[in-house]
């Protein structure tokens, strides 16, 4: 799996999970989230060469097509596979609200 | 939806469905598929700017992060959303086989 256990331990040019810490105030200009101040969002990046963690039959076909026809612009792309939620605390006026934001943290990647 | 109805009628630099016909023999070097000779595989390509068909909370956050921090290398990517199968005819020796290959045709795209 192209997850932290694999990707953070290996120097990898191909599609892999990359670390990214987002500070809500500094990086997004969001002041409304009270807690946490930021989180490990991570992201997916890297090349998708022939059969590298291909997600579907189509991405495998596209990967082969791109290998045989390297001048073509059609190639798979490295995107998130497994995501996890993030729980935040914010206020509406003086009323505290706890909310779970779905699909906020990338845990693994794939070529799709 | 970033499907043929929208994407094939509009000149679109952003993430959209792109037409791609794949000839099995010519483009993939596959001689084993008897019918069809090729098919409209299509593919997804194009930029994923702020809020363009963002798929998840993470891709929306990443889209905002990338807009505010354009020097960052973290940005969403244009990938397939809905896929359909393709039915093929091939032979094992002289025995014809009909098989449905899942997820072979891209019908729509998303920024993920």
């Amino acid at each position: 799996a192209l997850d932290a256990a694999y990707c953070f331990r290996n120097v990898q040019d191909n599609c892999c999970l990359r670390p990214l810490y987002i500070d809500f105030k500094r990086d997004l200009g969001w002041k409304w989230i009270h807690e946490p101040k930021g989180y490990n969002a991570n992201f997916c990046a890297g090349a998708c060469p022939y059969l590298w963690s291909s997600d579907t039959q189509h991405s495998r076909v596209l990967s082969l097509y791109n290998t045989i026809n390297p001048e073509a612009s059609a190639s798979p792309c490295c995107v998130s596979q497994d995501l996890e939620p993030l729980t935040i605390l914010y206020y509406i006026g003086k009323t505290p609200k706890i909310e779970q934001l779905s699909n906020m943290i990338v845990k693994s990647c794939k070529c799709s | 939806a970033l499907d043929a109805a929208y994407c094939f009628r509009n000149v679109q630099d952003n993430c959209c469905l792109r037409p791609l016909y794949i000839d099995f023999k010519r483009d993939l070097g596959w001689k084993w598929i008897h019918e069809p000779k090729g098919y409209n595989a299509n593919f997804c390509a194009g930029a994923c700017p702020y809020l363009w068909s963002s798929d998840t909370q993470h891709s929306r956050v990443l889209s905002l992060y990338n807009t505010i921090n354009p020097e960052a290398s973290a940005s969403p990517c244009c990938v397939s959303q809905d896929l359909e199968p393709l039915t093929i005819l091939y032979y094992i020796g002289k025995t014809p086989k009909i098989e449905q290959l899942s997820n072979m045709i891209v019908k729509s795209c998303k920024c993920s």
């Epitope: 997004l28 200009g29 409304w32 909310e99 | 809020l51």
Partner: nanobody, 116 residues
Framework: QVQLVESGGGLVQPGGSLRLSCAAS????????MAWFRQAPEKQRELVAL???????AYADSVKGRFAISRDNAKNTVYLQMNSLKAGDTAVYYC??????????WGQGTQVTVSS
């Protein structure tokens, strides 16, 4: 019910200025990232300027140094000051409100025409 109402569009000569306003209702405005998009005939809708809930801004390369986005949370309004207008700025300008906890909302648009 969420409403975004744009105003301030019109006909202006090249080199002139306009100030667009977008008044929001039905949302916790201070939590929303606000943006102006535009769409010219036969072209795709493009981001012009963005201001986050905390005041961070971003601009399309084509308008940097000419346009300025601002917001007034007390008035639930976002503004777009457009200076040194060019013919290429002619488009329908749309206001957008986005908060990660909800879907995004769009205004109906206001026409800006730059012509002599």
């Amino acid at each position: 019910q969420v409403q975004l109402v744009e105003s301030g569009g019109g006909l202006v000569q090249p080199g002139g200025s306009l100030r667009l306003s977008c008044a929001a209702s039905g949302i916790t405005f201070s939590h929303y990232d606000m943006a102006w998009f535009r769409q010219a005939p036969e072209k795709q809708r493009e981001l012009v300027a963005l201001i986050t809930s905390g005041g961070k801004t971003a601009y399309a390369d084509s308008v940097k140094g000419r346009f300025a986005i601002s917001r007034d949370n007390a008035k639930n309004t976002v503004y777009l000051q457009m200076n040194s207008l060019k013919a290429g700025d002619t488009a329908v300008y749309y206001c957008n409100a986005h908060w990660v906890l909800t879907s995004q909302y769009w205004g109906q648009g206001t026409q800006v025409t730059v012509s002599s």
